[in-house]
């Protein structure tokens, strides 16, 4: 039996700059029941606060609701582990909410096979930004990637589309079924997970409909 090992805050993420969660790895418990508490202060403030919500985001986590989240202040966060034999504290972690955004994937992915005047066929992929992001006001600047592959293929073909919410894919094989997904990344944050997969078959005998 021994004091607990040093915990480590290993991840903090925000879906929208309005709430965020931090998760920690507990370290060894020293063979004893061990309690964990997350405490934080904010830049320029002397006060220290305890985690407002240990439940919402699951075990070994702290959820900061809107009421506790500010993008104007840096959070200095530590996790303390305590058992009968002693205690141990993580290294402090400095968190700027602007830099931990991992948004939801883009929504309303639509796929349409189109044809140019020269009869060249292409796949027109369109989508919308995730619901929660206020892209119009510049609060978020979002970049996008799409990936596609034919059902038979092993590898995805990835296209970076910049800030565009549509993309044209040429040189696709007629008769093949293609799977498509999109993801997004805010200017200072992390890529979202890949969104829901959509599929479309490229017709063998595509003719332009009026």
């Amino acid at each position: 039996q021994s004091p607990p090992g040093k915990p480590e805050i290993h991840k903090c993420r925000s879906p929208d700059k309005e709430t965020f969660t931090c998760w920690w790895n507990p370290g060894s418990d020293g063979g004893l029941p061990t309690n964990y508490s997350l405490t934080y202060s904010k830049e320029g403030e002397k006060n220290t606060y305890e985690c407002p919500d240990y439940k919402t985001s699951g075990p070994n986590s702290c959820f900061f609701s809107k009421q506790y989240t500010s993008i104007w202040k840096i959070y200095i966060i530590t996790v303390n582990a305590t058992n009968e034999m002693g205690s141990s504290t993580s290294d402090p972690l400095y968190v700027d909410v602007t830099y931990i955004v991992e948004p939801e994937p883009p929504r309303n992915l639509t796929l349409e096979v189109k044809q140019l005047k020269d009869k060249k066929t292409y796949l027109w992929v369109k989508w919308l930004p995730p619901t929660i992001t206020d892209v119009k006001t510049g609060w978020f600047t979002m970049e996008y990637e799409i990936r596609l592959k034919s059902e038979e293929a092993d590898e995805w073909e990835i296209h970076f589309t910049g800030h565009q919410t549509q993309f044209k894919v040429f040189d696709l094989y007629p008769g093949q079924k293609y799977l498509v997904q999109t993801r997004c990344k805010p200017d200072h944050g992390y890529w979202s997970r890949w969104g829901q997969e959509k599929s479309i078959e490229i017709p063998n005998d595509f003719t332009l409909k009026d």
């Epitope: 480590e8 320029g44 840096i74 400095y94 602007t98 830099y99």
Partner: antibody
Amino acid sequence: QVQLQQPGAELVRPGTSVKLSCKASGYTFTSFWMHWVKQRPGQGLEWIGVIDPSDTYTNYNQKFKGKATLTVDTSSSTAYMQLSSLTSEDSAVYYCARGDYSNWFTYWGQGTLVTVSA
Amino acid sequence: DVVMTQTPLSLPVSLGDQASISCRSSQRLVHSNGNTYLHWYLQKPGQSPKLLIYKVSNRFSGVPDRFSGSGSGTDFTLKISRVEAEDLGVYFCSQSTHVPWTFGGGTKLEIK
């Protein structure tokens, strides 16, 4: 505690390439972005670029595009920077540096001195 | 790129004196989120740089309160109220509001 270990020095020939390493320990490697910074002898610091080890997303200073390539090996918690077509202008100390979830550098490696000489 | 200009280049001081270093940026350093990402680092001889001040005026963990930062827009200052021997080295200002992040040329604090 967080440590970033870099080899002390590399002597390389002009026109060749060199791959610098930065072995991270004391934290979850994939959770924090890794930056690289150049310092020429007696001069200031230049930010080269950054890599997100969780998905290898990179962002380069335009000045170093084509010169530096950032990669990671998550199995060994090591970040790499390859410098190509070396000239005397590339002789410098190169640091890897980690931020927290912020845009400054909280932890620095000791730096690798690269000397380009025939 | 944002150019960071530090003055003076060299600052000879006596131990116990106050020291002041200026840093001027070629563009305003207010980020779209309202924060000003101007930081100060100290590099002691033979060592890697270490963070002293983040976001203009916030002392990093373990940094003595004799260090203070101030400023806004394009003009920033680092002050050391009573210089100690361990403060000697090269001080760099740095901005991370605009990509690429850039550094000042450095100010060498040395004994008079």
